[in-house]
Interface confidence: low
């Protein structure tokens, strides 16, 4: 059955070389004295991407990242030496790794770095307008970076700068043990989470921070932190990691007598991303790696996309889960986690919850408490001892929307674009991996909008060497994706519709919401452009309905590639054919010489099928004829290649091997009469090369050819060898067999 596609594989897989050759990636390969291009800040208005790296801050042009400005911000020699004396690595640790890069106001950015284990912050002037072209460090104004940037560059930081105040989740000490969520800058006293209390934070790895409004009243605004941490004893048997979402009220100024300069509204809940397994045991993806908030229409209710990996070293897997803010809020309004009972296990708190409910932001909306400093003591006491919620937050549809477990990579980053297509709106995910590839995945609603099918459109290699992707930003204005890693920064378009092919069916099969068939090409789909030829079917990807009558004939350039291959009796030959789409299934047909009838090729000892094509072993005369390679995808059949195989009998070959050039040999003439003079130059030698059964090795064969060549050269001094490089060419061709079918222009394997 040819209908069943290979849905879990990317339809297109593009190597770094293919990406470069097709002008689909622009890379900034880093500076010799820098690395760690991990901290991104996108400024759509100025059309700049600011990137914090080792000892540098860059300002890249969003149109083309090859155009950039840079600020060098290293540490002093004294600081570097102190760091080295403390036993740190001079290259990997004793430098200024930029960890915080945020817009401070209309004219300045705020940046913090590790400062060689001595965190430091400053302001960067960027001017009022893009045309000001200002990008400079405020050298006169450096600030202590403690509680803003970690000391250790290996540690993750999550930060958010709003209304002149910096919220950061980071480590506040040299040893990297005192983790906290801080609020610094601004006019108020710094605030942090309770110190040395594992119930609040237990060795967290911070991922990101986001401001989300609760209501139309700004007093209810909350800052949400996403992180992963060690599960608290009793929460889980054995050492385990839990993914978390934490909340704090923006207007939390700490308590009056207790929790002074500490958060009084901090609450956290577990994020579950799991798939049901056999025997009722779920497979959990607990290692939260990245979060993306899709704000659409209602900023109070963004959809949260989370990238998770497994904790196990044995079972490597990744998943993407989606969460709704209404589910998050429901959990924060649910029971608190409480330790009780003889085993001191975690149970839902059943007692009286003080008023106003801990975690509620002080506002006139609820009970008239203007400030957290006015909260009753019992509220503060309860908040201190009950920071965690009992119920976890489950993903939409109770399962991941993307799962990858059968691959040699793990997910690291995600950005999502909501795309208007002909038949609805689709979320297109760009997922970064730890081997430097980007997956482009579209989630397609099946029966209901939350019952989603994942379609892996493309897998693109964006860096020359495998390197983990550590930062990603998406510009809707430029329709470009920006990717950061230790090695550098890459830029690629969100859509490259032309790569899908030159036929309506190929465009339709791609199921890329960005693309549609416009009557003559696969091109960018704009909902506003009322072009009637636009064909697109994201939901089903069915070309038979949408394209069946749009010609796939020769004058439209869809005729199959035609090749002639010569094989020697009793030897083997390989017919190469691999479709552009990895999701297509290939089947072969054989048509005997002078026969109309085509039969499907059955695999046996004589014929072996591979992903690259068909291997015919021990060739016989009856194998001569036409071999047709067809690709089948979603019921659509496309003929990719027609190979005419000519099998030469051994007797004939002996004749060719030993006949002199001057010799007549009617058989030779008969066999080569279809060839051009330039082809005749080398074809005779070539035919001997194909596993001639009477020659032990290629060396032996080449030796014979060269001897004969020398002999002929002596006999005819005026003869000029027209193909002195032919063996080099042949051997190169023997090497490069794993190629796409659109690269057929090669000699001498295809005459």
């Amino acid at each position: 059955n040819y209908q069943n596609g290979k849905n879990n594989v990317p339809r297109l897989k593009l190597s770094y070389k293919e990406m470069l050759e097709s002008n689909n990636v622009i890379t900034f390969n880093g500076l010799a004295n820098s690395s760690s291009y991990h901290t991104f800040l996108l400024d759509e208005e100025r059309s700049r991407l600011y990137v914090g790296a080792k000892d540098h801050i860059f300002s890249f042009d969003l149109v083309n990242i090859k155009d950039f400005q840079k600020i060098v911000w290293p540490v002093s020699y004294t600081r570097r030496d102190e760091c080295k004396w403390a036993g740190k690595d001079i290259l990997k640790e004793c430098a200024n790794f930029i960890k915080v890069l945020k817009a401070y106001n209309q004219t300045h950015l705020y940046a913090c770095g590790t400062g060689a284990f001595h965190p430091i912050c400053t302001y960067i002037e960027i001017g009022h307008h893009p045309e000001d072209n200002i990008f400079k460090l405020e050298n006169s104004h450096f600030e202590n970076g403690r509680g803003k940037s970690p000391y250790d560059p290996k540690l993750l930081t999550a930060s958010l700068l709003i209304d002149g105040e910096l919220y950061s989740g980071t480590a506040a000490d040299f040893m990297g043990r005192d983790f906290a969520i801080f609020r610094t800058l601004g006019h108020h006293h710094p605030i942090r989470t309770e110190q040395h209390d594992s119930r609040w934070l237990n060795d967290p790895k911070f991922i990101s921070a986001h401001l989300i409004s609760e209501s139309d009243n700004p007093e209810d605004d909350k800052v949400y932190f996403f992180f992963r941490e060690n599960a608290i004893d009793g929460e889980h048997s054995g050492k385990a990691t839990h993914a978390r979402i934490g909340q704090i009220c923006k207007n939390d100024f700490g308590g009056h007598r207790s929790l002074v300069n500490k958060w009084t509204t901090f609450l956290k809940a577990r994020l579950i991303c799991s798939v049901p397994g056999p025997n009722g045991i779920d497979t959990h993806f607990d290692e939260l790696q990245d979060v993306f908030l899709m704000n659409f229409k209602d900023p109070k209710n963004p959809v949260v996309y989370g990238v998770f990996t497994t904790s196990s070293n044995i079972f490597k897997g990744s998943a993407v889960c989606m969460y709704s803010m209404s589910d998050v809020r429901r959990v924060f309004l649910g029971p608190y986690a409480h330790r009780d009972g003889p085993n001191y296990q975690w149970v839902p708190y059943q007692g009286r919850v003080p008023y106003p409910r801990p975690g509620t932001c002080p506002s006139k909306t609820f009970g008239g408490f203007d400030s957290t400093k006015d909260l009753p003591d019992d509220v503060i006491t309860f908040a201190r001892s009950h920071p965690a919620m009992y119920n976890p937050v489950f993903p939409m549809n109770n399962r991941p929307i993307v799962i990858k477990t059968d691959v040699n990579y793990q997910f690291t980053q995600i950005v999502v674009d909501r795309v208007d297509a002909e038949d609805g709106q689709y979320d297109v995910m760009f997922i970064g991996t730890d081997v430097g590839t980007v997956l482009k995945v579209v989630s397609i609603p099946k029966e209901t909008w939350y019952d989603l099918e994942e379609v892996l459109l493309e897998e693109m290699t964006v860096f020359r060497e495998p390197t983990a992707i550590s930062a990603m930003e998406l510009s809707t204005k430029q329709q470009q994706l920006y990717i950061g890693s230790t090695a550098g920064v890459a830029q690629l378009p969100l859509h490259r519709c032309d790569i899908y092919g030159k036929a309506c069916a190929e465009c339709c099969l791609a199921r890329d919401p960005y693309c549609a068939w416009d009557g003559s090409a696969c091109s960018r789909y704009f909902p506003t452009a009322k072009r009637r030829t636009r064909r697109q079917d994201i939901r089903n990807g069915d070309p038979l309905t949408h394209c069946s009558d749009l010609h796939h004939d020769n004058h439209h350039g869809h005729s199959p590639e035609e090749r002639i291959i010569y094989g020697v009796e009793n030897s083997s030959t390989f017919l190469e054919c691999s479709p552009k789409s990895q999701r297509a299934l290939v089947y072969w047909q054989f048509q005997r010489r002078n026969e109309e009838r085509k039969e499907e090729i059955r695999v046996d000892d004589h014929i072996i099928r591979t992903d690259q094509g068909l291997l015919l072993r021990s060739l016989q005369q009856k194998d001569s004829g036409n071999y047709l390679c067809h690709a089948v995808e979603h019921g659509f059949i496309q003929t990719l290649l027609k190979v005419t195989l000519e099998v030469i009998d051994t007797e004939h070959l002996e004749e060719l091997l030993h006949k002199d050039d001057d010799g007549d040999g009617s058989k030779t003439k008969e066999m080569s009469n279809s060839m051009t003079p330039s082809q005749k130059v080398w074809y005779r030698d070539f035919m001997q090369l194909i596993n001639h059964p009477n020659l032990n090795t290629m060396d032996e064969f080449c030796e014979q050819v060269w001897k004969r060549d020398r002999k002929q050269r002596r006999q005819r001094p005026g003869h000029t060898p027209g193909n002195s490089n032919k063996w080099k060419h042949l051997q190169e061709n023997k090497k490069g067999r794993n190629r796409r079918t659109h690269e057929f222009e090669r000699a001498p394997r295809s005459v």
Epitope: E422, G424, G519, R535
Partner: antibody, heavy 120, light 107 residues
Framework: AVTLDESGGGLQTPGGALSLVCKAS????????MQWVRQAPGKGLEWVAA??????WYGAAVKGRATISRDNGQSTVRLQLNNLRAEDTGTYYC???????????????WGHGTEVIVSS | ALTQPASVSANPGETVKITCSGG????????YGWYQQKAPGSAPVTVI????KRPSNIPSRFSGSLSGSTNTLTITGVRADDEAVYFC?????????FGAGTTLTVL
């Protein structure tokens, strides 16, 4: 078999509004473009409107007055025509495209038609 | 505008050809359809769509062919019940159009 049944025609008053419904059966309507074509008495065929999933197109004579919509669940296509004029009189046919292209070239099935008379 | 002859006539058994030109193109290719209407106000019947496709209920004596930008409807072995008005239809990106119709009279 593919069937298209139009309804909603009849005597209409100038300046009024008209709502025609086409009920489709025998095929999965959501995959195809649907069109409305009309014919004034003694005249030829005139294309009115077309809908393909979400995109819509209208003929010059009805642009700004017509709205075409579809309900794939109910397998219906609706044509709403406002500010009716005497020249809107005729038989209105619902038509299905053989593939998704909005063109008279691709119509492979027609409804029996519903007659509309605009008169005071 | 689509151009087609106003009328054609033929004796039973003869071959009739009706041409239609002036259609719009999709990506450089021209597409036409042919519709038979036996009486004014009665439902048209598609005899050819997409230049040469014939619906399953249409007899094989009806065929369509495209030459350049002109489409030809051919009825081989015309019969009395083929008497009708034949409209051609086409489109491009900006509009969908029908010809004025060709009246086929079977003598």
């Amino acid at each position: 078999a593919v069937t298209l049944d139009e309804s909603g025609g009849g005597l209409q008053t100038p300046g009024g509004a008209l709502s025609l419904v086409c009920k489709a059966s025998g095929f999965t309507m959501s995959s195809y473009e649907m069109q409305w074509v009309r014919q004034a008495p003694g005249k030829g065929l005139e294309w009115v409107a077309a809908i393909y999933t979400r995109s819509t197109w209208y003929g010059a004579a009805v642009k700004g007055r017509a709205t075409i919509s579809r309900d794939n669940g109910q397998s219906t296509v609706r044509l709403q025509l406002n500010n009716l004029r005497a020249e809107d009189t005729g038989t209105y046919y619902c038509a299905k495209s053989g593939i998704g292209l909005n063109s008279a070239a691709f119509i492979d099935a027609w409804g029996h038609g519903t007659e509309v008379i605009v008169s005071s | 505008a689509l151009t087609q002859p106003a009328s054609v006539s033929a004796n039973p058994g003869e071959t009739v050809k009706i041409t239609c030109s002036g259609g719009g193109s999709y990506g450089g290719s021209y597409y036409y359809g042919w519709y038979q209407q036996k009486a004014p106000g009665s439902a048209p019947v598609t005899v050819i769509y997409t230049n040469n496709k014939r619906p399953s209920n249409i007899p094989s004596r009806f065929s369509g062919s495209l030459s350049g930008s002109t489409n030809t409807l051919t009825i081989t072995g015309v019969r009395a019940d083929d008497e009708a008005v034949y409209f051609c239809g086409s489109a491009d990106n900006s509009g969908t159009a029908f010809g004025a119709g060709t009246t086929l009279t079977v003598l």
